[in-house]
Interface confidence: low
């Protein structure tokens, strides 16, 4: 792979509305604006939803989100989890598009990837996806 | 090829590493199928919060 | 040779359910989702939802949300729709298709359809 | 949910004529490059059949005579020269985004 970070995004998308749906950054410091819905009860692991066996998910249950939990101390629990992911796609042209994202293709490659991410997370835990950034491989 | 890199958030506790992984891992026969898509080298890693976008600095598996 | 076998006719009343079987034969059951697809008499097709035999993942239509149930049988390789709270414009043929790919350069597809079960819905 | 909308709704032509049905859909179908339609012939009391797969690839089986194209929001399915046999009806499909939708079919009966 060759290449610094090119176009990069901070969007949520997240699994409460329909897979277009995204929302802007709730601060720089943080790419995330967790859905109000999701701070109403303890959510649990629905494994029937999920691709994995049963006994590979984990039922905790959580604490319930609220407007406290977004302060960037790190001494605080947040409540949310992150993990950084990446991937190739080998079938796919890296083009100077992927470059800028005010473009069509850009836009329309982020679009795509974060409704196959609210497939694949379907369970109840899954807050959504920010900071998609492209580059070639 | 195109190289994706984003960050996920999940409700803590719901999900380790692991699983996030092996869920995406198991996906990427259906991506194929459905969306012609060829998915290869994925790597996870936990961030630490409050993460900055931009360090990247994590230990892949 | 890829088939997809339905059960027979159903005659129901108003309220009642109804379960209809799909047994797959000539392929790998566990890996290819099956769909379920509905026709009323003289009408077109109407996708119902589909169900992922290995996982029991499914996927339904909104539309059914809530009155349809799909489960699957790997020891018989069998898929069923369970249509519950039957009211007369459920009368129709309904289908179950494989989304596979037998199609040449591995894209995947609704290539394989099962005969049809005729439902009927009157009191 | 994506809208399917075919025209015309009933095609009537003579043997050896060029057939040309249309499917529109309300919003993009394409993802990555893969146009997510597909093609189906269904004759009275038969299940549907699988002609054209993602908008532009001929089934195995299916003669050459059939053929589809398009891409994004507007396809075409075209039967280069119609046989008898090939009176049905037509149906596209979109697998893009749950609910899949189909179209309400293209009637093509003969002159």
């Known amino acids: 792979a060759s290449g610094s970070a090119s176009g990069s995004a901070s969007t949520l998308v997240h699994n409460g509305t329909s897979a277009r749906a995204t929302t802007t950054p709730a601060s720089k410091s943080t790419p995330f604006s967790i859905p109000s819905h999701h701070s109403d009860t303890p959510t649990t692991l629905a494994s029937h939803s999920t691709k994995t066996d049963a006994s590979s998910t984990h039922h905790s249950s959580v604490p319930p989100l609220t407007s406290s939990n977004h302060s960037t101390s790190p001494q605080l629990s947040t409540g949310v989890s992150f993990f950084f992911l990446s991937f190739h796609i080998s079938n796919l042209q890296f083009n100077s598009s992927l470059e800028d994202p005010s473009t069509d293709y850009y836009q329309e490659l982020q679009r795509d990837i974060s409704e196959m991410f609210l497939q694949i997370y379907k369970q109840g835990g899954f807050l959504g996806l920010s900071n998609i950034k492209f580059r070639p491989g | 090829s195109v190289v994706v890199q984003l960050t996920l958030a999940f409700r803590e506790g719901t999900i380790n590493v692991h699983d996030v992984e092996t869920q995406f891992n198991q996906y990427k026969t259906e991506a194929a199928s459905r969306y012609n898509l060829t998915i290869s080298d994925v790597s996870v890693s936990d961030v630490p919060f409050p993460f900055s976008a931009q360090s990247h600095h994590h230990h892949h598996h | 040779e890829v088939q997809l076998v339905q059960s027979g006719a159903e005659v129901k009343k108003p309220g009642a359910s109804v379960k209809v079987s799909c047994k797959a034969s000539?392929?790998?059951?566990?890996?290819?989702?099956i769909e379920w697809v509905r026709q009323a008499p003289g009408q077109g097709l109407e996708w119902m939802g589909e169900i992922l035999p290995g996982t029991g993942r499914t996927n339904y239509n909104e539309k059914f949300k809530g009155r349809v149930t799909f489960t699957a049988d790997t020891s018989t390789n069998t898929v069923y729709m369970e249509l519950s709270s039957l009211r007369s414009e459920d009368t129709a043929v309904y289908y179950c298709a494989r989304y596979g790919d037998d199609t040449s350069g591995g894209y995947y597809a609704v290539d394989y359809w099962g005969q049809g079960t005729t439902v009927t819905v009157s009191s | 949910d994506i809208v399917m909308t075919q025209s015309p709704a009933t095609l009537s032509l003579s043997p050896g004529e060029r057939a040309t049905l249309s499917c529109r859909a309300s919003?993009?179908?394409?993802?990555?490059?893969?146009?997510?339609i597909h093609w189906y012939q269904q004759k009275p009391g038969q299940a549907p059949k699988l002609l054209i797969y993602?908008?532009?690839n001929l089934e195995t089986g299916i003669p050459a005579r059939f053929s589809g194209s398009g891409s994004r929001t507007d396809f075409t399915l075209t039967i280069s020269s119609l046989e008898p046999e090939d009176v049905a009806v037509y149906y596209c499909?979109?697998?893009?985004?749950?609910?899949?939708?189909f179209g309400g079919g293209t009637k093509v009966e003969i002159k």
């Open positions: 993602h908008a532009s």
């Open positions: 919003e993009s179908v394409n993802i990555l490059g893969t146009n997510l």
């Open positions: 499909l979109q697998s893009r985004k749950i609910p899949w939708t």
């Open positions: 000539g392929y790998r059951f566990i890996p290819y989702w």
